[in-house]
């Protein structure tokens, strides 16, 4: 979390922004809140990024003012505006891509004074993983696949019963590029289970961490997955 | 050549669900945001709703929020439309759009368009 | 919502003159603004984009303009095929959305 002030103290606001993580490929939000005030149009929000010279997104006067908006960000920004008056003034990112990664300034002018926060947005690729039983394999094998990851993960396989177990030797991890060439799918196959058992697929880079669960008993097979983001810091 | 092949269209009583799909090729499918637009019979354009290119994310029209579903196959090249609740002001010719690459928000590819028609 | 509204609704002009249409948006929308034309029974087809940006395998005489709320499309020496019915798009936002269109008729 990152509170910012605004420069004189007597006309300075409180400014909020959250760290956050973006999907390549996929529309990301860019936290930021700030002390609201009563009327719309003396609002402005603009949105910096350190390094590129034009806005990323300005918001003034009830409505988005786009004149000085960065050609890399054509078409992509667009702020909640029915929540600006309630001190909302988050970005919505469409399509996220790799190059958007880097240092953002959420800059807020109100009738109460100025403020503004930085916020570290790193983008990458996630996605949840899916555990199967490989029925095409020699032994009781299990496959985990999720289709979209970057920077390339680490994949740990874990058991209910043999906790602690390294699973390494009897475990094949392989990575394949998309046809983005950036993301990549990850597969990793882990040999010799045994039934009765819960198996965890761990996939972990330094943007996000998913984990696909499976228990196979005679009767059933029961799945479970989740995905949490690592770097959700408030500033 | 790329091409959108729209299908799913028909006639559907009021409160009818139907599901739209729209079977892609000639292009990397899931590099590109998709959308559908339609058109009501001698309307203009309406956009209805969009999905990233992973799937992950979508964005609806005011007009069928939370009754459309919009959804991608990226394994099947197939993009869908899950429609609810229809209604007779949904009846129009519902066409598949490919949304430029670099940048977003305007329709390089159209399919041909499926026809719904909502009516008792 | 940014609502476009495109003028006149019908133009009716001879093969060989020049036609201007015109998209008028409600709030400023820079120069996120493309054109479509649209024959009978067909799909749309892009022209234009970010306004006055060509596509390639659109002839030449198609141009575009303007920025801010006014954006005009120009065909410099009409064609037969060019009768069709002509939509701008707004482009700017999540929501997106089409002019009224402009119907251009043989006189």
């Known amino acids: 979390l990152i509170i910012g002030f605004g420069i004189s103290g007597r006309h300075s606001i409180t400014v909020t922004t959250v760290a956050s993580a973006g999907n390549i490929g996929e529309d990301g939000i860019l936290s930021c809140t700030f002390e609201p005030d009563i009327k719309l149009s003396d609002i402005v929000i603009q949105w910096l990024k350190e390094g590129v010279l034009g806005l990323v997104h300005e918001f003034k006067e009830g409505k988005d003012e786009l004149s000085e908006q960065d050609e890399m960000f054509r078409g992509r920004t667009a702020v909640f505006a029915d929540q600006v008056i309630v001190g909302n003034a988050s970005l919505r990112l469409k399509n996220v891509q790799l190059t958007d990664a880097g240092t953002y300034k959420c800059y807020i002018i109100t009738s109460k004074g100025k403020g503004n926060a930085n916020l570290e947005y790193k983008t990458g690729a996630f996605s949840m993983p899916e555990v199967n039983v490989d029925y095409n394999a020699s032994s009781e094998t299990l496959r985990c696949e999720a289709p979209r990851w970057f920077p390339q993960p680490t994949v740990v396989w874990a058991s209910q019963v043999d906790q602690g177990a390294n699973f390494s030797e009897v475990s094949n991890t392989s990575f394949e590029l998309n046809s983005e060439n950036v993301t990549m799918k990850v597969v990793s196959v882990l040999y010799n289970v045994t039934i009765n058992n819960t198996y965890s697929c761990m996939i972990e880079n330094d943007i996000a961490k998913a984990t696909g669960d499976i228990k196979v008993t005679e009767s059933e097979i029961k799945r479970r997955s989740h995905l949490q983001l690592l770097n959700s810091k408030a500033s | 050549e790329v091409q959108l092949v729209e299908s799913g269209g028909g006639l559907v009583q009021p409160g009818g669900s139907l599901r739209l799909s729209c079977a892609a090729s000639g292009f990397t499918f899931s590099n590109y945001y998709m959308s559908w637009v339609r058109q009501a019979p001698g309307k203009g354009l309406e956009w209805v709703a969009y999905v990233s290119s992973g799937g992950g994310s979508t964005y609806y029209s005011d007009s069928v929020k939370g009754r459309f579903t919009i959804s991608r196959d990226n394994a099947k090249n197939t993009l869908y439309l899950q429609m609810s609740s229809l209604r007779a002001e949904d009846t129009a010719v519902y066409y598949c759009a490919r949304e430029s690459y670099s940048q977003g928000n305007y329709f390089d590819y159209w399919g041909q368009g499926t026809t719904v028609t909502v009516s008792s | 919502e940014i609502v476009l509204t495109q003028s006149p609704a019908t133009l009716s002009l001879s093969p060989g003159e020049r036609a201007t249409l015109s998209c008028r948006a409600s709030?400023?929308?820079?120069?996120?603004l493309h054109w479509y034309q649209q024959k009978p029974g067909q799909a749309p087809r892009l022209l234009i984009y970010?306004?006055?940006q060509s596509i390639s395998g659109i002839p030449a005489r198609f141009s575009g303009s303007g920025s801010g709320t006014d954006f005009t499309l120009t065909i410099s020496s009409l064609e037969p095929e060019d009768f069709a019915v002509y939509y701008c798009?707004?482009?700017?936002?999540?929501?997106?959305?089409f002019g009224q269109g402009t119907k251009l008729e043989i006189k």
């Open positions: 709030q400023s929308i820079s120069d996120y």
């Open positions: 970010f306004a006055s």
């Open positions: 798009q707004n482009g700017h936002s999540f929501s997106l959305t």
